[in-house]
Interface confidence: low
């Protein structure tokens, strides 16, 4: 009779992570009597996957009933496959011996390849805000994918970026891989509503890439522009002085009025108006009683924005001239309602 052969018909089996792998193995004869075992890898360091005779292998089930006397199908199924399960699996026939069974013949091996999806990309920006015209770095990370081949792209508002560096680790063979990419983005004043997107494409994603996003609103600081103007009011001895704070982001802003260098009042921006580009405008005004002053008054609007050093704009109020003859600009907005009389 022809000597028993162990046949593993599949040289390679491809399984997606989380699914079940079927590893096929048949013997050509019932003789010699003895159990089969499945191993991952060959040689002394091989890992026992299944032993027909004894042991508990909860992830492994047999395709056919191995207790039947005439069974020659030793195929197994391994459930909930992970990238760590990748490798070459050998079906090995043992001959009954005393005291131990003796390895008799091995199959040629089946290479199990595992496809694992990358994790959702996580995009992180700089720790501190930056102003327009500055270049900031964003990082994107994704982990746990296999095989190693992966594509990463960066976009800003749908436009692909080119200034980035990407690394896939580890460099050598591994059960799964990670990708890390750093992109450089130049900020503009219009970027409050902008998004930076990291897009990862991988064989397991079936053409639907994963995306991670970062809002530039968390990264950008648009410093305000200040304009101080005066205009007369009905009472001849009163002048309305306004400080228009325009195009700033984020909203966190503190304004201080100074009269001839002395602090008059400090207030925090509250009822702001939002521009289309996401920046804010705010206006504060003072009602100045000029009849109480013999000398000219230097009014200063000082703004501290988002914890940055203060910026200021001054206006000289001429007491000698009639208030109604002062040059005036009509206020564009009137969102503040702060009144101050000087006596």
């Amino acid at each position: 009779e022809e000597e028993l052969q162990v046949i593993q018909p599949d040289k390679s089996v491809l399984v997606a992570a989380g699914e079940t792998a079927t590893l096929r193995c048949t013997a050509t004869s019932l003789i010699p009597v003895g159990p089969i075992q499945w191993f991952r890898g060959a040689g002394p360091g091989r890992e026992l996957i299944y032993n027909q005779k004894e042991g508990h292998f909860p992830r492994v089930t047999t395709v056919s009933d191995l207790t039947k006397r005439n069974n020659m199908d030793f195929s197994i199924r391994i459930g909930n496959i992970t990238p760590a399960d990748a490798g070459t699996y050998y079906c090995v026939k043992f001959r009954k011996g005393s005291p131990d069974d003796v390895e008799f013949k091995s199959g040629a091996g089946t290479e199990l390849s595992v496809r694992a999806k990358p994790s959702a990309p996580v995009v992180s920006g700089p720790a501190a805000r930056a102003t327009p015209q500055h270049t900031v770095s964003f990082t994107c990370e994704s982990h746990g994918f296999s095989p190693r081949d992966i594509t990463l792209k960066w976009f800003k508002n749908g436009n692909e970026l080119s200034d980035f560096q990407t690394n896939v680790d580890p460099v050598g063979e591994s059960v799964s891989y990670s990708i890390h990419s750093t992109a450089k983005v130049v900020l503009t004043r219009e970027d409050v509503h902008s998004q930076v997107i990291c897009e990862v494409a991988h064989v397991t994603l079936q053409g639907d890439p994963l995306r991670g996003t970062a809002n530039l609103s968390e990264t950008i600081r648009v410093p305000p522009t200040l304009e101080v103007t005066q205009q007369p009011v009905r009472a001849e001895n009163q002048v309305n002085v306004t400080c228009q704070v325009r195009k700033f982001y984020p909203q966190r802003l503190q304004l201080t009025w100074l009269e001839n260098g002395n602090v008059s009042r400090t207030e925090t921006a509250s009822t702001v108006t939002e521009n289309k580009d996401g920046t804010y405008n705010w206006m504060s005004w003072l009602l100045v009683n000029v009849s109480a002053h013999r000398d000219d008054v230097k009014l200063t609007c000082q703004v501290e924005h988002d914890g940055q050093p203060a910026v200021s704009k001054s206006h000289d109020l001429k007491v000698s001239a009639h208030p109604k003859e002062q040059g005036s600009n009509t206020a564009a907005e009137n969102t503040g309602s702060n009144e101050r009389n000087i006596y």
Epitope: S12, L14, S113, Q206
Partner: antibody, heavy 117, light 107 residues
Framework: EVQLVESGGGLVQPGGSLRLSCAAS????????MIWVRQAPGKGLEWVGI???????HYASWAKGRFTISRDNSKNTLYLQMNSLRAEDTAVYYC???????????WGQGTLVTVSS | DIQMTQSPSTLSASVGDRVTITCQAS??????LAWYQQKPGKAPKLLIY???KLASGVPSRFSGSGSGTEFTLTISSLQPDDFATYYC?????????FGGGTKVEIK
């Protein structure tokens, strides 16, 4: 963009040989299982053979011995070497890329092989 | 080798019809089956994989079912763009044969 482009087709005499190429762009061939399929004029799709990540190959029973699949990772190109060609090998030959979960989701445009004297 | 038998070979239908195509495998292939659509002069397009999973970008009117040896492709409401030839393909073990194809034509 992920793409496969076949080339190398043409007219060949019976008994002759031809090597078809399938150039991949946008991904690395070495990370994917790649298939060759053919379609005779007015007929259905017919599996020719496959090459695995490990480089091991498998063929339809009719293709064994005459057809050989290989790949050159440095050129990111898949090949189909066809020997002892017959008139019935006249067909459009397609290469395809295996999807991780099953099936072939990326295909080339095909290249026509005509075997005639 | 596994053999795939597809039926019918030709099917005449009208827009809006529910269309069913069957595919039989000579051996148990579990759920390792794909369905493709092919139009004249074009490469096949993957519709369904793993017997019942819809490929990316494929309209939901296409669905697949079955496991083991019997499989079905259903188009719930036939559209003008669906007139084409459909193929099943096994990818079990080391064998990747196609069915003979079903041509869906206008009635």
């Amino acid at each position: 963009e992920v793409q496969l482009v076949e080339s190398g087709g043409g007219l060949v005499q019976p008994g002759g040989s031809l090597r078809l190429s399938c150039a991949a762009s946008g991904f690395s061939l070495s990370n994917y299982e790649m298939i060759w399929v053919r379609q005779a004029p007015g007929k259905g799709l017919e599996w020719v053979g496959i090459i695995y990540v490990s480089r091991s190959t498998h063929y339809a029973s009719w293709a064994k011995g005459r057809f050989t699949i290989s790949r050159d990772n440095s050129k990111n190109t898949l090949y189909l070497q066809m020997n002892s060609l017959r008139a019935e090998d006249t067909a459009v030959y397609y290469c395809g890329r295996y999807l991780a979960s099953g099936g072939f989701n990326i295909w080339g445009q095909g290249t026509l092989v005509t075997v005639s004297s | 080798d596994i053999q795939m038998t597809q039926s019918p070979s030709t099917l005449s239908a009208s827009v809006g019809d529910r269309v069913t195509i069957t595919c039989q495998a000579s051996h148990n292939i579990y759920s390792n089956l794909a369905w493709y659509q092919q139009k004249p002069g074009k490469a096949p397009k993957l519709l369904i994989y793993d017997a019942s999973k819809l490929a990316s970008g494929v309209p939901s009117r296409f669905s697949g079912s079955g496991s083991g040896t019997e499989f079905t492709l259903t188009i719930s409401s036939l559209q003008p763009d669906d007139f084409a030839t459909y193929y099943c393909q096994s990818y079990y073990g080391n064998s990747y044969p196609f069915g003979g194809g079903t041509k869906v034509e206008i009635k």
